[in-house]
């Protein structure tokens, strides 16, 4: 298992080990100093769904997890392996939403996540691109992105809609756990640097009234459930079944299971990559498994911006400026 | 996370010209817009140019019309912009984005309107 990976560091010394002794203490404390350093890294979590009232269309959620507010969020999507790719929708907190086919309605649900609804028929239907990025911005601190996929799939399948709702307690797990984990490494880190300045060098004790020991076993949990917790995932119920799809890569089942970890998904690859990609330890990820009937036509061209402008709850009215090139 | 690194500023002549090149890393750099806008000192930021994700669709702002060229490398997930012919006026620091600012209107433009940025590259035209 790989919390283990880190005990065996931190056991005692087998005899005419003495000097490496200062060096083992070491290791717990840099491994929860980096604990305490990365586990606010922001991320972003993605959610495809198929309505069950209109198989055609789907509605896409992302989310942001992380203490700075939203500047801007970017919805694109785009062919697989690398095709070139068409921004979805814009939201900005203050200046307003634009959208574009065959988006139907983008709109804010919380101050850190947004929904997107897609029309799918024909030339517009969401199977002809394969792969959804959601990119928040916060300024100044940064901008992130999470990318869902949607492979072709040999058999519609036959799973039910994902609900939202764990989506959100697992946010919540996460948050709560990392919290908890942190501020149990946190304040650990400190009385073992403190009992390190205090302390002569460490004598050799046999491997029974060695404190280290259970130090280790007693923090490995901890990691194995910070590793658990920080896992606010979502759930993916997409199999498209595309009439003009060059890229097409046919599948033995019913079901198609990836994991991608969204923290580093800067560009898509193919499905058989993901298929072996391992789940990560740390972040969110999308696992992709869907029934949608929808049938796919080809990838339609990028079209221009709707001379509407949709209202922000949370903003005034969007100025609607000279359109760009789109 | 996202990064978009700029490079190629520097000191150039009346009339010389310069090649700006902004490398992205950390997102999906051909499924967006990307721009160039600028910050003359004590002035606000003036958008410069924009490029659609497949680089098919370009556009200026008029003062750079026919002397600048904005390009896009999605192999090589960077962005470039030819700058020929330059003026003391076009002196700024020039910013990488993501986005197009035409999306909300030109006016009062941040860098908090685009999706990602750079640090910026100083471009200086003087003799």
């Known amino acids: 298992m790989r919390t283990e990976a880190q005990v065996p560091a931190l056991q005692p010394p087998e005899p005419g080990l003495e000097g490496a002794m200062g060096h083992r203490t070491l290791v717990l404390p840099w491994v929860l100093l980096t604990l305490c350093v990365t586990a606010g890294t922001p991320e972003v979590w993605v959610q495809v769904r198929m309505e069950a009232t209109e198989l055609s269309s789907f509605t896409i959620r992302c989310g942001f997890l992380g203490s700075g507010s939203i500047s801007l969020v970017t919805v694109s999507w785009g062919g697989p392996n690398g095709a070139g790719g068409t921004t979805l929708a814009v939201l900005h907190p203050e200046r307003g939403i634009r959208q574009w086919a065959p988006a139907r309605q983008a709109r804010w649900e919380t101050q850190s996540s947004i929904s997107l609804i897609l029309e799918g028929s024909g030339a517009s239907s969401p199977c002809a691109n394969t792969t959804f990025c959601c990119k928040f911005a916060s300024f100044p601190e940064g901008s992130w992105e999470a990318c869902g996929s949607l492979p072709p799939s040999s058999d519609p399948g036959l799973s039910a809609p994902p609900t939202p709702a764990p989506i959100l307690r697992a946010d919540l797990a996460g948050i709560l756990g990392v919290s908890g984990v942190l501020l149990f490494g946190c304040v650990y880190l400190l009385h073992l640097l403190r009992r390190h300045k205090h302390r002569p060098a460490p004598r050799l004790q046999p491997s029974r009234t060695s404190p280290q020991a259970p130090r280790a076993r007693a923090w490995a949990p901890s990691q194995a459930s910070q590793a658990a917790l920080h896992v606010p995932y979502a759930t993916i119920n997409t199999s498209c079944r595309p009439a003009t799809l060059d890229t097409a890569h046919p599948h033995g089942g019913p079901s198609w299971w990836a994991s991608l970890p969204t923290h580093a998904a800067h560009r898509p690859q193919g499905p058989a990559a993901w298929a072996s990609t391992p789940i990560p330890a740390r972040g969110s990820f999308v696992s992709v498994e869907n029934g949608l009937y929808a049938q796919a036509g080809e990838r339609p061209p990028h079209t221009g911006p709707g001379l509407t402008l949709f209202p922000d709850p949370r903003g005034p009215r969007a100025m609607e400026g000279p359109l760009g090139v789109r | 996370e996202v990064q978009l690194v700029e490079s190629g500023g520097g000191l150039v002549q009346p009339g010389g010209s310069l090649r700006l090149s902004c490398a992205a890393s950390g997102f999906t750099f051909s499924y967006y817009d990307m721009s160039w806008v600028r910050q003359a000192p004590g002035k606000g930021l003036e958008w410069v140019s924009t490029?659609?994700?497949?680089?098919?669709?370009?556009s200026y702002v008029d003062s750079v019309k026919g002397r600048f060229t904005i390009s896009r490398d999605n192999s090589k997930n960077t962005l470039y912009l030819q700058m020929n012919s330059l003026r003391a006026e076009d002196t700024a620091v020039y910013y990488c984005v993501e986005g197009d600012p035409h999306n909300f209107g030109l006016e009062n433009l941040s860098l908090r309107d685009f999706g990602s940025w750079g640090q910026g590259t100083m471009v200086t035209v003087s003799s």
């Open positions: 490029i659609n994700s497949n680089g098919g669709r370009t």
